[in-house]
Interface confidence: low
């Protein structure tokens, strides 16, 4: 686990002709805010693919009013870092997307208007725990200067935040082969699981499954005393078993200073030079308080009762996260009814409705039959948002405009012959059957005569209608 941090230094018009004077439109003053999106790997991903590593939104910057006579300087920016917490291992390779948004504060119907001003996408390699990386990127006529880094959160350490620390057991030093755990000198690295049977006293491992021997010991499980051993060239805590030195780090090896602090060795110890916003022996304590305005998106800041948190943000509806930096996925609440598609536009939700429905949540069922006539005596029927006509006999199709063959469905039973008729159809029954569809057998002693075809019709001719 850890945090990716992005610090925006400046955003303004790039060099060269055609640089814009102001980010604001003619509608009046505006202010800027930033969105950062992290995606794993170095592959070119679609812009709309999810920010799988996380995303964050900055606070709104100060209001900017265009001064038409003067070229735009670096624009007033939101204060503070953009922080994107990550739960799992830091991937090392990632795509960084930084969006600059403009919020127009003129008289807008329905509140402020948002628009994307610039977007930079860069694929990067970065180890956790390293120093700030600085970058300058151009997006159209705009130039963005920023720094970023990834840092682990205890107990995770290492370039991928996958190694864990544990409190050290011995008061004097870490156990055999275990280094002091940066960035906390009073903790030791949690040992990896060594090869089964590896001597606890004389062996250690840096990778799971291995068994490396301390000086003076040998064998696959470090059980065999070595006849001779040289302890030269090694530094670190003294081994009580052999009087030799176990390989170990110098005070600044692995950089014990957290949060981008730089380490300098002092006699027998080290000292951290911390960046702004962090302090403590190892720069491990964040100096952010409510006075620094850490709560984004209108969150209310209160001093934390928990000693480990100097402040707590109470987030407004629609936002969450320790700094109210994460927008709640409002579409997960399925606000759109009747199969509407939910779109979270950032400043608002929008429902894209299916045909036959309307309204902010597609809650309104349109009158499908309004203004829609069914031809040839058909009747309009509403249902499920779909317009449908119930057609008169002899007609079919969506609007009853197509002539239908009433005999196509072979309605006459027992071999009866079907004759299309202006009022529908007539069945001429085979001997021994009767009824409008020839469905009834005639009494054995009765005789049934085949009725003559209506004038002008030939039997079985469906093409001719009166």
């Amino acid at each position: 686990a850890g945090v990716f941090e992005l610090q925006i230094h400046s955003f303004g018009p790039g060099p060269g002709p055609g640089a814009p004077r102001s980010p604001c439109s003619a509608r009046g003053p505006c202010r800027l805010f930033f969105r950062v999106c992290l995606k794993p790997g170095l592959s070119e991903e679609a812009a709309e693919s999810p920010c799988a590593l996380g995303a964050a939104l900055s606070a709104r910057g100060p209001v900017y009013t265009e001064q038409p006579e003067a070229p735009a300087p670096d624009l007033p920016l939101p204060n503070g870092l953009l922080q994107v917490p990550f739960r799992d291992a830091w991937p090392g390779t990632f795509s960084l997307i930084i969006e600059t948004w403009r919020e127009e504060l003129g008289d807008q119907i329905g509140g402020p208007a948002w628009s994307l001003l610039a977007r930079v996408t860069r694929r990067r390699r970065l180890a956790a725990g390293g120093p700030w990386a600085r970058d300058i990127q151009r997006a159209g006529a705009w130039e963005l200067r920023f720094s970023y880094r990834a840092r682990c959160e205890l107990p995770a350490v290492g370039t991928a935040c996958t190694r864990l620390c544990r409190p050290r057991s011995a008061p004097s030093r870490c156990g055999p082969g275990l280094r002091p755990c940066a960035p906390l000198e009073d903790e030791c690295e949690a040992p990896p699981v060594c090869r089964a049977g590896c001597s606890l006293e004389h062996g250690f491992c840096e990778q799971p499954g291995e068994c490396r021997c301390l000086e003076g010991w040998t064998g696959p499980l470090c059980m065999v005393p070595a006849s001779t051993s040289s302890c030269l060239g090694l530094r670190g805590p003294s081994s009580a078993t052999t009087g030799c030195l176990v390989p170990g780090p110098g005070p600044c090896d692995g950089n014990p200073c957290a949060n981008g602090g730089s380490c300098s060795e002092t006699p027998g110890s080290f000292e951290c030079t911390c960046p702004r916003g962090f302090y403590g022996l190892r720069c491990e304590v964040s100096g952010v308080t409510c006075a620094d305005g850490p709560c984004f998106n209108g969150g209310l800041c209160v001093g934390g009762a928990d000693p480990d948190s100097a402040y707590i943000c109470h987030c407004p509806p629609g936002f969450q996260g320790s700094n109210c930096e994460k927008r709640v996925d409002r579409c997960s609440l399925q606000p759109c009814r009747n199969g509407g598609l939910c779109l979270d536009l950032g400043h608002a939700l929008r429902c894209r409705c299916r045909a036959g429905f309307a309204g902010p949540r597609c809650e309104h069922n349109l009158d499908d039959c309004a203004g829609r006539a069914c031809a040839n005596g058909g009747t309009c029927v509403e249902g499920g948002g779909a317009h449908r006509c119930s057609c008169a006999l002899g007609f079919g199709g969506r609007d009853c405009r197509e002539r239908a063959d009433p005999c196509a469905a072979r309605p006459c039973a027992h071999g009866g012959r079907c004759y299309a008729h202006f009022s529908g159809l007539v069945c001429a029954c085979a001997p021994g059957y009767m009824g409008s569809r020839c469905e009834f057998p005639v009494h054995p002693d009765g005789v049934s005569a085949l009725p003559a075809a209506p004038p002008g019709l030939r039997p079985g001719d469906p093409q001719r209608y009166l």
């Epitope: 000292e271 030079t273 302090y279 491990e284 952010v288 480990d308």
Partner: antibody, heavy 118, light 108 residues
Amino acid sequence: QVQLQESGPGLVKPSQTLSLTCTVSGGSISSYYWSWIRQPPGKGLEWIGYIFYNGITNYNPSLKSRVTISLDTSKNQFSLKLSSVTAADTAKYYCARIHSGSFSFDYWDQGTLVTVSS
Amino acid sequence: EIVMTQSPGTLSLSPGERATLSCRASQSVSRGYLAWYQQKPGQAPRLLIYGASSRATDIPDRFSGSGSGTDFTLTISRLEPEDFAVYYCQQYDTSPITFGQGTKVEIK
């Protein structure tokens, strides 16, 4: 309102250990850094060291070998021990709270003058 | 360590005048880690400015701080009788915390 009150002897013999205690009232000792600063007569301020509520300490390298700052959260107190004192350690000793975020000293006590003399 | 040098050592002014005190660091100091204090005889120092330019609680607005990098300034726009004292700057960009040697503002 946070208040700090020092206690300890005003006179210490050379080579002995200077011991001072600072009691915090009006607020919890937890979640802040607490520091000691001294000022020799007629001179400027010198930072001695600090301690965090979890016991982490940082000392001025010029005094590091002789300084111990400790904390008793149950009594809302923190203490200074300066060993092997000499006349050069004669000063007014202040305890102070460090403002979270700017590392400035926002609350001070009135100070105790400690004289090192036989 | 970062050495903080204040100038002038003594500033002789009359009430109502403007006082400008300088503090120079031997290496760059982040804005967030520079503070100014006022100390009157027999009293503890009192925090005036933190973060180079933010006034501490209950500090009158005639006190203002500015500067960045290695050069910082404390300005008292109009000296009041109670402002005559010694002023110290202090940094904690790099351990150890260090103070300037002080500037004494005295009545002319």
